[in-house]
């Protein structure tokens, strides 16, 4: 049985077995299709999500349509059920919480008050002024709190207990990459993660330790990532896994929180980096235990420039290393997170490419997550 | 000198099959991103196909199930091969190299005519 | 797909003047733009890439500027060789798409 399962894959209606190296190759080799069915699936971009959060206090921003102008929300008669509307729209099925924040001296949006039509928030259409004086800062899920802290050095052995959103992404019980919780169903990660092996079927997750091997696996439904770009290969490096049964939560298993849209980070930002891949630049073997690492943000300028990646990082990616080089992600960290920490951690960045690893001109570079949001967003609509 | 060389346009009949062959010079080859591009008598630009360096595939609707992009590394050749032609794919047919997001290298083209 | 819309379709124009091209995308493309200039009988040229960077051995009169939906192409000061249909084009996503032209004539 276990031999049938791991080389074979059994067709129905006629029951037949075929190879399991045509699984998912974009032919229908059983009558019904089925081979191709649980799949790594691409998803459109889709249209602009229609509300979007602020790093400034977690403010919530209400997009109008007609005219592609953005505006702040007023707390005024904001509810509960408005609420839960913005978060639907961005995909959390989770239930929110909401409070007013005054409204700053930088506020360079129009303040306007929120109501609900079709399940989407509107502007009021004859909305005063914003008589609370105060903007809705919202949090759909919590997230980005760990029961520990780290400490800022060089590489050291990290603690679950840090990183309790840490994941290992498995193909048939390997450790391929490393990931991110999101929430309960979803598990964000790379996409190039999947491009040897795009069957859904023997792909598992691992949650709630920092040793590779101790933990049970999870069962993946789907695994989703963006619509390629062929004319920049290098984009896009971005998936999401959703889960066969959504997690519980617990202080070794915990989501970190996605970046706000306009999280920009100025170079040398101090970020972290974590995972247990290879230790050494083709060193030959993923650490068993998970590490981690203090680095910070590089320039694009500078990671672009004729001695480094050549143009190469686009608008799309960030690069993230130490000036001096020698502290970076490496093979098998593919797929974790590069993250920031303010009131809570953000994934900022997926660890996606490089040239070696730790060379002083040539960073880690990493998705940028905030360049995606929107695609997260739309996916996790879909999937409600 | 860097350049890129289309051939194997031609008159062929609805419904018939042609192959167009690009020859690269002067560059890395295998480590490029090569695509097809045409253009109607005419008309605009529009994409056809795209090459992987690993030989990843990819194309527009118009054309999927119908032509099949390909490359020959140790030969530096792009290949198109078209089948199952229709009348609106007359063109002049363009092999270009990407980087970084746009098409920094073309050939001359070759016109492939569909028609009875 | 994303669609992409040129104008003007055509323009007449003498040695010499200033012309601008406008580009506009279906939906935000971000700088994710190039332009090229392609005479009768020949290969298109790439003349800018991602909006604004000027290519290797194209002429300083010409500029790109533009970011989101709205993009223009500048030939500062026309010169005889300038007289050309021009194309813009998204990479941003799959698939790339080309605008319909524009062909700028001597007047």
């Known amino acids: 049985k276990v031999i049938l399962d791991k080389y074979y894959f059994l067709c129905g209606q006629p029951l037949h077995f075929i190879p399991r190296k045509q699984l998912c190759d974009g032919e229908l080799d059983c009558p019904l299709g089925e081979d191709e069915e649980h799949c790594v699936k691409s998803f459109p971009e889709g249209p602009a999500v229609a509300v979007r959060l602020s790093k400034d206090r977690s403010t919530l921003q209400v997009l109008d349509s007609a005219t592609g102008n953005w505006f702040s929300a007023c707390f005024d008669n904001f509810t509960e059920a408005l609420a839960e509307t913005a978060c639907r729209q961005m995909g959390y099925s989770s239930k929110p919480t909401f409070r007013a924040v005054e409204i700053g001296p930088d506020q360079d949006l129009d303040v306007v008050e929120i109501t609900e039509n079709s399940q989407e928030l509107r502007m009021r259409n004859s909305s005063g002024p914003c008589l609370s004086g105060s903007l809705v800062s919202l949090h759909c899920l919590a997230c980005g709190k760990s029961l520990k802290t780290p400490r800022v050095v060089g590489v050291e052995e990290a603690s679950v207990d840090s990183w309790p959103w840490q994941v290992s992404i498995q193909y048939d019980k390997q450790h391929v990459c490393g990931g991110s919780i999101l929430d309960p169903h979803w598990v964000l990660t790379a996409a190039h993660c999947f491009r040897k092996h795009t069957d859904v079927f023997n792909w598992k997750v691992r949650a709630g330790s920092d040793k590779l091997g101790s933990f049970p696996s999870l069962a993946v439904a789907k695994i989703i990532i963006i619509e390629f770009n062929p004319m920049y290969p290098k984009d896009n490096d971005i998936a999401l896994m959703k889960l066969q049964f959504p997690l519980t939560f617990s202080g070794t298993v915990r989501p970190i929180c996605l970046p706000f849209f306009d999280e920009e980070l100025t170079p040398a930002t101090p970020l972290w980096i974590i995972g247990w891949g290879f230790t050494k630049q083709n060193g030959g073997k993923m650490s068993d235990i998970l590490l981690q690492a203090s680095v910070q943000v590089i320039d694009s300028t500078r990671c672009n420039a004729d001695d480094a990646y050549q143009g190469e990082v686009t608008e799309k990616m960030m690069c993230a290393g130490i000036p001096e080089g020698g502290v970076d992600t490496c093979q098998g960290d593919s797929g974790g997170p590069l993250m920031y920490q303010s009131d809570q951690w953000h994934v900022v960045g997926i660890v996606s490419w490089g040239y070696g690893c730790g060379g002083p001109s040539t960073p880690g570079v990493y998705t940028k997550v905030s360049a995606y949001l929107n695609w997260i967003y739309n996916v996790w609509k879909a999937e409600l | 000198e860097v350049q890129l060389l289309e051939s194997g346009g031609g008159l062929v009949k609805p419904g018939g099959s042609l192959r167009l062959s690009c020859a690269a010079s002067?560059?890395?080859?295998?480590?490029?991103?090569m695509h097809w591009v045409r253009q109607a008598p005419g008309k605009g630009l529009e994409w056809v196909s795209a090459?992987?360096?690993?030989?990843?595939?990819y194309y527009p609707g118009s054309v999927k199930g119908r032509f099949t992009i390909s490359r020959d590394d140790s030969k530096n050749t792009l290949y198109l091969q078209m089948n199952s032609l229709k009348t609106e794919d007359t063109a002049v047919y363009y092999c270009a190299r990407v980087r970084l997001g746009h098409f920094d290298l073309w050939g001359r083209g070759t016109l492939v005519t569909v028609s009875s | 797909d994303i669609q992409m819309t040129q104008s003007p379709s055509s323009l007449s124009a003498s040695v010499g003047d200033r012309v601008t091209i406008t580009c506009r995308a279906s939906q935000s493309i971000s700088r994710y733009l190039n332009w090229y200039q392609q005479k009768p009988g020949k290969a298109p040229k790439l003349l800018i890439y991602a909006a604004s960077s000027l290519q290797s051995g194209v002429p300083s009169r010409f500029s790109g500027s533009g970011s989101g939906t709205d993009f223009t192409l500048t030939i500062s000061s026309l010169q005889p060789e300038d007289f050309a249909t021009y194309y813009c084009q998204q990479s941003y996503s799959n698939p790339p798409t080309f605008g319909q032209g524009t062909k700028l004539e001597i007047k």
């Open positions: 002067g560059f890395t080859f295998s480590s490029s991103w």
């Open positions: 090459i992987g360096t690993a030989g990843d595939t």
